[in-house]
Interface confidence: low
């Protein structure tokens, strides 16, 4: 079953998924898609990283973390009931039928407050800073040679709530791991 | 062709406000995020505030925190600043500044000429 | 005062390179990949000359390089032209979501 995270109305939503690159620069191609994830692919793409960058994003979904590390957990700005749904994270590993999944359920509560508007509202009141300890950034363009022996070593997304309030590296400990190879 | 153009700069008394706009083309404003920068007379370039693509996320330098509103709307391709409580130090050429992506950590590869503000009594 | 030190001017001769530096923290230019450089002409906006530390904005040309170690930045102009006397700006992306110029060199081309 998907892990359940939640947000209100207006609020960003915060979706963690990670995974660790076997060396600095060898990345792995990365989608996030609304829906549960299909055997390929990611359906109705928001945001897609390729082994150099971010190729493709649309204006509400963004990375919050520094995915030249692995952290790919999707930000999506000024949610509306409309963003409830599942969303699939797909670490897409060299190789056939090697791709790790990970449908994640985001549930949008009406606000119980009127909010400010968000376009003038300060990420860290929203979002505490606890929960974006590292920059966020585009992957380096570097010539990268075969991707096959990545031999990743870990892949994990997180089981907590984003209520939780715990550092994101502490949510990254807790995650589930998966080993390659 | 990308092009950022700001006016609504002036001089205004310590204590007042302005607000700034930048009208942008030639590129998808709502897939960028965007800055203000500022150069003091005969200084050096400083960082203002930043707004992510979406709009919902915005970062403030600590000079001007809790005086300064950054938005934008999207629907006219317009960034804005809000500039309340003017102090002298304020007084600068205001740049507007597209980032290459929606990423804070990204550089700006697009700038507009600058509007002046100057503050003074 | 800048977090980000640059020296304020160097000078070089035509057809010879010239290096500026830009030292900063663990929390900004040591941080991450994400210094940038700016070239600025008397009277103009700055240019975006190299992002990611080391890549090259369009339309740059390779005489421009950059390179970073550590806390320190580089940038590295070679082949220097009569033009490329301007201000030169280095900026970091830092750990706590804000953005840091440095100071600016002033590049005089002999």
């Known amino acids: 079953s998907e892990v359940e995270y939640r947000a209100e109305v207006g609020q960003n939503a915060y979706l963690p998924c990670f995974y660790t690159p076997a060396a600095p620069g060898n990345l792995v191609p990365v989608c996030w898609g609304k829906g549960a994830c299909p055997v390929f692919e990611c359906g109705n793409v928001v945001l897609r990283t390729d082994e150099r960058d971010v190729n493709y994003w649309t204006s509400r979904y963004w990375l919050n973390g520094d995915f030249r590390k692995g952290d790919v957990s999707l930000t999506i700005e000024n949610v509306t009931l409309a963003d409830s749904g599942i969303y699939c994270c797909r670490i897409q590993i060299p190789g056939i039928m090697n791709d790790e999944k990970f449908n994640l359920k985001l549930v949008i509560k009406p606000a119980k407050v009127t909010p400010a508007p968000t376009r003038q509202r300060d990420f860290t009141a929203a979002f505490p800073r606890m929960l974006t300890t590292r920059g966020h950034g585009p992957a380096e363009t570097q010539t990268l040679g075969s991707l096959p022996d990545i031999n990743l070593t870990q892949i994990s997304t997180l089981a907590n709530e984003l209520r939780d309030s715990r550092l994101a590296n502490d949510l990254r400990d807790s995650g589930a791991t998966i080993r390659i190879g | 062709q990308v092009q950022l153009q700001e006016s609504g700069g002036g001089l205004v008394q310590p204590g007042g406000s302005l607000t700034l706009s930048c009208a942008a083309s030639?590129?998808?404003?709502?897939?960028?995020?965007m800055s203000w920068v500022r150069q003091a007379p005969g200084k050096g370039l400083e960082w203002v505030s930043s707004?992510?693509?979406?709009?919902?996320?915005?970062y403030y330098a600590d000079s001007v925190k809790g005086r300064f509103t950054i938005s934008r709307d999207s629907a006219k391709n317009t960034l804005v600043l809000q500039m309340n409580s003017l102090k002298p130090e304020d007084t600068a050429v205001y740049y507007c500044?597209?980032?290459?992506?929606?990423?804070?950590?990204?550089?700006?590869?697009?700038w507009g000429q600058g509007t002046q503000v100057t503050v003074s009594s | 005062h800048s977090a980000v030190t640059q020296p304020p001017s160097v000078s070089g001769s035509p057809g010879k390179a010239v290096t500026i530096s830009c030292v900063g923290s663990?929390?900004?230019?040591?941080?991450?990949?994400?210094v940038s450089w700016y070239q600025q002409l008397p009277g103009m906006a700055p240019k975006l000359l190299i992002y990611?530390?080391?890549k090259r904005a369009s339309g740059i040309p390779d005489r421009f390089s950059g390179s970073k170690s550590g806390n320190t930045a580089s940038l590295t102009i070679s082949g220097l032209q009569s033009e490329d006397e301007a201000d030169y700006y280095c900026?970091?992306?830092?750990?706590?979501?804000?953005?840091?110029f440095g100071g600016g060199t002033h590049l005089a081309v002999l």
């Open positions: 030639g590129f998808f404003f709502s897939s960028y995020a």
């Open positions: 900026a970091s992306y830092r750990s706590d979501s804000n953005f840091v």
């Open positions: 990611d530390v080391e």
């Open positions: 707004i992510s693509a979406g709009g919902g996320t915005s």
């Open positions: 663990s929390s900004d230019v040591g941080y991450g990949d994400y």
């Open positions: 500044a597209k980032k290459r992506q929606n990423f804070w950590s990204e550089g700006y590869d697009s």
